[in-house]
Interface confidence: medium
């Protein structure tokens, strides 16, 4: 029986019964989060031979080997992967060996075997026989091989039963468990699989076969399975499906998406039966089974039943996620909110076309409309009373519409209306008229020159910085004293600053009027002496951090068309000095010989600069008596040391010798310090570990059903 679309067995080990009749799992297999140790010996699934996606095992208490569960699992195809991996074994507390002695092929993807404190028989498996490339395999934090004492069948009796291969210049026997060898096919078979009796399978077989050179006797297919036969490509009028079998059009038309109950059914594209058109393609009509290329980004049409969609919160904006065409009218009324600009961009940033009108009113939280970053066409098929298709009324903090240097917006029909937007300069509105092609449509009262921009510095001069000085947590800057036509018009300056890892910030980035302005603001009074340049000391900054800074002059009276004349600087990027790092993290120590300790730690969370070296101090402690209480000749009685808890892979440490013999009588000396590249690699490794663990947790922890 083909099972799927992915089987998730969690919490209750008896759910394993769902695998009873499965020969192929079309999809993934998760076995996870079974916290009560159970006896798995009565569970055996000899029918299961293929998993088309991946196998994930995570925190299954009491499970000591996979060999009894899946004695005939031969192929994991890796058609879809779990974070680049086709086999993941993570935090399996009791697993002693993998034991998948019939596993012959992982077609795509790597393996990740991590933090399994009791897991042995890892160094005895030659993964290169199973995977095409082993370089991406990640096997760390398991039981150290020195404590495992892995013995392949027959080696104790000096009648070794398993074959040898070379891994990392080590020629050794290859096995899965103490009584199961790793199967290898004769070299005469080349890349082909073989039977249990070492006869070569048909070239289209994968993993194994029940009879030699027979494409109907394969355990799994190298390419595709069709009507009981392994074929190199799907026959005419059949289509690839789920990466492993061929189906006909009738099958594809009738199958029901396992993931989405409201999808439009499967499609046929490029010889494949798939759930949705691939990226860059769209269905050729809503009931069509075929795909055509999109022109530009693929459209997603969203429609509002009531014609007008009111955006008054992040929740209401969420409904528009992914929409490129909005059929209807948009009424934006954002009075408050947290981090509103970036949230709106996230949910509305793909909208390109609005078929009706756009009305923005009482949106005191908005500083800019740049969150509609792809809007290029307002059709104006429906208009407000007075024939308005773009209406902006009473937005107390709106300062920018869009960045017109990088924006092409057309309003096909209807007029624009602007009133009571005190911080929106009329020049900005006039610029919009030109860009959108609405110039000449508006009548005199449609753009109110009195109450738009009445509280903004609309004609700006440029302020120039004159000096900058930095320390580890301070920046001192000064700038030219601004001289408006009437000196009494100048009230003060406002300095804006924020952390800026990259030199790509703009004044309105992530800015709204509800405190989610990502800029910090400091007011600077005018120096009493007219000849002294204004300046400020910014303190409480982070060491070795790049900041963006700009300054605005705050001016008073109405001049030139009743508008304030103001001034502001360009954005300046400046880095603070380095400082003392925070303490190193996760210090661990272990002994790898009678005269050596290996100490391992992670870099500090706040390096505060480029780290150049560490200082390690140590002192002698009294000997621990428990070390004498064990018989080290008895394999089973070796105590698990503190570092075999799935948190440190000691082999990783001992691979590189820590001492080397120096010339003459010098004796041993310290290993060379790590290069920058090595340090960077370690940093990336630690980051990668965290990212994977986060991905794992985010993928598998789901809310309990109601």
């Amino acid at each position: 029986e083909i099972c799927g679309p992915g089987i998730d067995i969690r919490n209750d080990y008896q759910q394993l019964k769902r695998l009873e009749n499965c020969t192929v799992i079309e999809g993934y297999l998760h076995i996870l989060l079974i916290s009560k140790a159970e006896d798995y010996r009565s569970y055996r699934f000899p029918k299961l031979t293929v998993i088309t996606e991946y196998l994930l095992l995570f925190r299954v208490a009491g499970l000591e080997s996979l060999g009894d569960l899946f004695p005939n699992l031969t192929v994991i195809r890796g058609w879809k992967l779990f974070y680049n991996y086709a086999l993941v074994i993570f935090e399996m507390t009791n697993l002693k060996d993998i034991g998948l002695y019939n596993l012959r092929n992982i077609t795509r993807g790597a393996i990740r075997i991590e933090k399994n404190a009791d897991l042995c028989y890892l160094s005895t498996v030659d993964w290169s026989l199973i995977l095409d490339a082993v370089s991406n395999n990640y096997i760390v934090g398991n039981k150290p091989p020195k404590e495992c004492g892995d013995l392949c069948p027959g080696t104790m009796e000096e009648k070794p039963m398993c074959e040898k291969t070379t891994i990392n210049n080590e020629y050794n026997y290859r096995c899965w468990t103490t009584n199961r060898c790793q199967k290898m096919c004769p070299s005469t078979c080349g890349k082909r699989a073989c039977t249990e009796n070492n006869e070569c399978c048909h070239p289209e077989c994968l993993g194994s076969c029940s009879a030699p050179d027979n494409d109907t006797a394969c355990v799994a297919c190298r390419h595709y399975y069709y009507a009981g036969v392994c074929v190199p490509a799907c026959p005419p009028n059949t289509y690839r499906f789920e990466g492993w079998r061929c189906v006909d059009r009738d099958f594809c038309a009738n199958i029901l998406s396992a993931e989405s109950s409201d999808s439009e059914g499967f499609v046929i594209h490029d010889g494949e039966c798939m759930q949705e058109c691939p990226s860059g393609f769209i269905r050729n009509g809503s009931q069509s089974m075929y795909c055509i290329p999109c022109e530009g980004p693929c459209p997603k049409v969203c429609e509002e039943e009531k014609k007008t969609k009111t955006i008054d919160s992040v929740t209401s904006a969420q409904m528009l996620q992914g929409c490129t065409i909005f059929k209807g009218n948009l009424l934006i009324n954002i009075r408050r909110g947290n981090n509103i600009a970036s949230e709106l961009e996230n949910f509305m940033g793909l909208i390109e076309v609005v078929t009706g009108y756009v009305k923005i009113r009482h949106s005191h939280a908005l500083v800019s409309l740049s969150f509609l970053k792809n809007l290029r066409l307002i059709l104006g098929e429906e208009q407000l009373e007075g024939n308005y298709s773009f209406y902006v009324l009473d937005n107390q903090n709106l300062q920018q519409l869009w960045d017109w240097d990088h924006r092409n917006l057309t309003i096909k029909a209807g007029k624009m209306y602007f009133a009571f937007n005190p911080k929106l300069c009329v020049s900005e509105i006039y610029r919009m008229e030109e860009v959108t092609g609405t110039k000449g449509r508006q009548s005199k009262g449609d753009i109110n020159t009195r109450n738009n921009g009445e509280r903004a510095s609309c004609e700006s001069d440029v302020l120039h910085f004159t000096s900058t000085t930095t320390s580890k947590n301070r920046i001192i800057i000064t700038w030219h004293r601004y001289r408006p036509p009437d000196y009494r018009d100048l009230i003060s300056f406002t300095v804006y600053y924020k952390e800026a890892p990259f030199k790509n910030v703009t004044e309105y980035d992530g800015q709204d009027a509800c405190g989610s302005n990502s800029w910090n603001m400091v007011d600077v009074d005018l120096p009493p002496n007219k000849d002294v340049e204004p300046g400020i000391l910014l303190h409480g900054l982070k060491p070795w951090t790049q900041y963006a800074v700009y300054v605005k002059a705050v001016t008073l009276t109405m001049v030139e068309n009743d508008h304030i004349r103001g001034a502001k600087s360009e954005i300046l990027y400046i880095r603070t000095n380095a400082s003392v790092p925070s303490i190193p993290l996760d210090v661990l120590s272990a002994s790898n010989s009678s005269s050596q300790l290996i100490v391992k730690w992670n870099p500090p969370s706040l390096p505060n600069g480029n780290l150049s070296y560490y200082i390690v101090r140590w002192q002698r402690q009294p000997q621990d008596g428990y070390l004498y209480r064990h018989n080290y000749c008895s394999k089973d009685k070796i105590p698990i040391r503190k570092y075999a808890d799935g948190t440190i892979d000691i082999e990783e440490v001992t691979e590189n010798p820590k001492t080397e013999v120096c010339g003459g009588e010098k004796g041993p000396c310290c290993a060379c310090p790590k290069t920058e590249a090595e340090k960077q690699a370690e940093k990336e490794e630690a980051e990668y570990r965290k990212v994977f663990e986060n991905f794992l947790h985010n993928s598998i922890f789901v809310p309990r059903p109601e």
């Epitope: 083909i2 009507a227 006909d248 199958i255 029901l256």
Partner: antibody
Framework: QIQLVQSGPELKKPGETVKISCKAS????????LNWVKQAPGEGLKWMGW????????TYAEEFKGRFVFFLETSASTAYLQINNLSDEDTATYFC??????????????WGAGTS | DIQMTQTTSSLSASLGDKVTISCRAS??????LNWYQQKPDGTIKLLIY???RLHSGIPSRFSGSGSGTDYSLTISNLEQEDIATYFC?????????FGGGTKVEIK
């Protein structure tokens, strides 16, 4: 076109054996599951089980274990239902019906005309 | 086994009427509910699968709805050719089971 053609009506005595055939045409038999459904006179439909046309493995509903046998003649694109040791309760129309080898598609989209 | 109950064994309606047939499962069947039509000559065909999806070639006057344990089939505009017995079937848990059927006749 796609169809399942069933053999004609049968008249049997209690204790005898009957073999009903279901021939697939217009599609490849091995790509779809083949189900058997019973309808006693004046009654509803009862699913008897199915045969995996890839492997030949039958699955029987509890009530139909024992005397009922599903098997295939793949070369002739034909599935068979054999009932041994017939009794009066076996008087019914037997339908073959096609299902898809796909976990979320638990329905029968092509039916034979039935054999009584 | 999951029991499927069609409470109305037969109903009479006029041509052009809207007809609704209901079906109840003994437990939640997660929308895996299918509808079949059996004509007086005994031929059976699939109308709707997965609660509301119209099988190819079936007229749009047929529609399905429901969730959990309660489901229904609606014929929006009854035609002469719709005279038949309608069966529901659950596809949630083996063995698949059918309802007893609802016979639709013309008044």
């Amino acid at each position: 076109q796609i169809q399942l053609v069933q053999s004609g009506p049968e008249l049997k005595k209690p204790g005898e054996t009957v073999k009903i055939s279901c021939k697939a045409s217009g599609y490849n038999l091995a790509n779809y599951g083949l189900n058997w459904v019973k309808q006693a006179p004046g009654e509803g439909l009862k699913w008897m089980g199915w045969i995996n046309t890839n492997t030949g493995a039958p699955t029987y509903a509890e009530e139909f274990k024992g005397r009922f046998v599903f098997f295939l003649e793949t070369s002739a694109s034909t599935a068979y239902l054999q009932i041994n040791n017939l009794s009066d309760e076996d008087t019914a129309t037997y339908f073959c019906a096609r299902s898809i080898y796909y976990y979320a598609s638990r329905y029968f989209n092509v039916w034979g005309a039935g054999t009584s | 086994d999951i029991q499927m109950t069609q409470t109305t064994s037969s109903l009479s309606a006029s041509l052009g009427d809207k007809v609704t047939i209901s079906c109840r499962a003994s437990q939640d069947i997660s929308n895996y509910l299918n509808w079949y039509q059996q004509k007086p000559d005994g031929t059976i065909k699939l109308l709707i699968y997965y609660t509301s999806r119209l099988h190819s070639g079936i007229p749009s006057r047929f529609s399905g709805s429901g969730s959990g344990t309660d489901y229904s089939l609606t014929i929006s505009n009854l035609e002469q050719e719709d005279i038949a017995t309608y069966f529901c079937q659950q596809g949630n848990t083996l063995p698949w089971t059918f309802g007893g059927g609802t016979k639709v006749e013309i008044k």
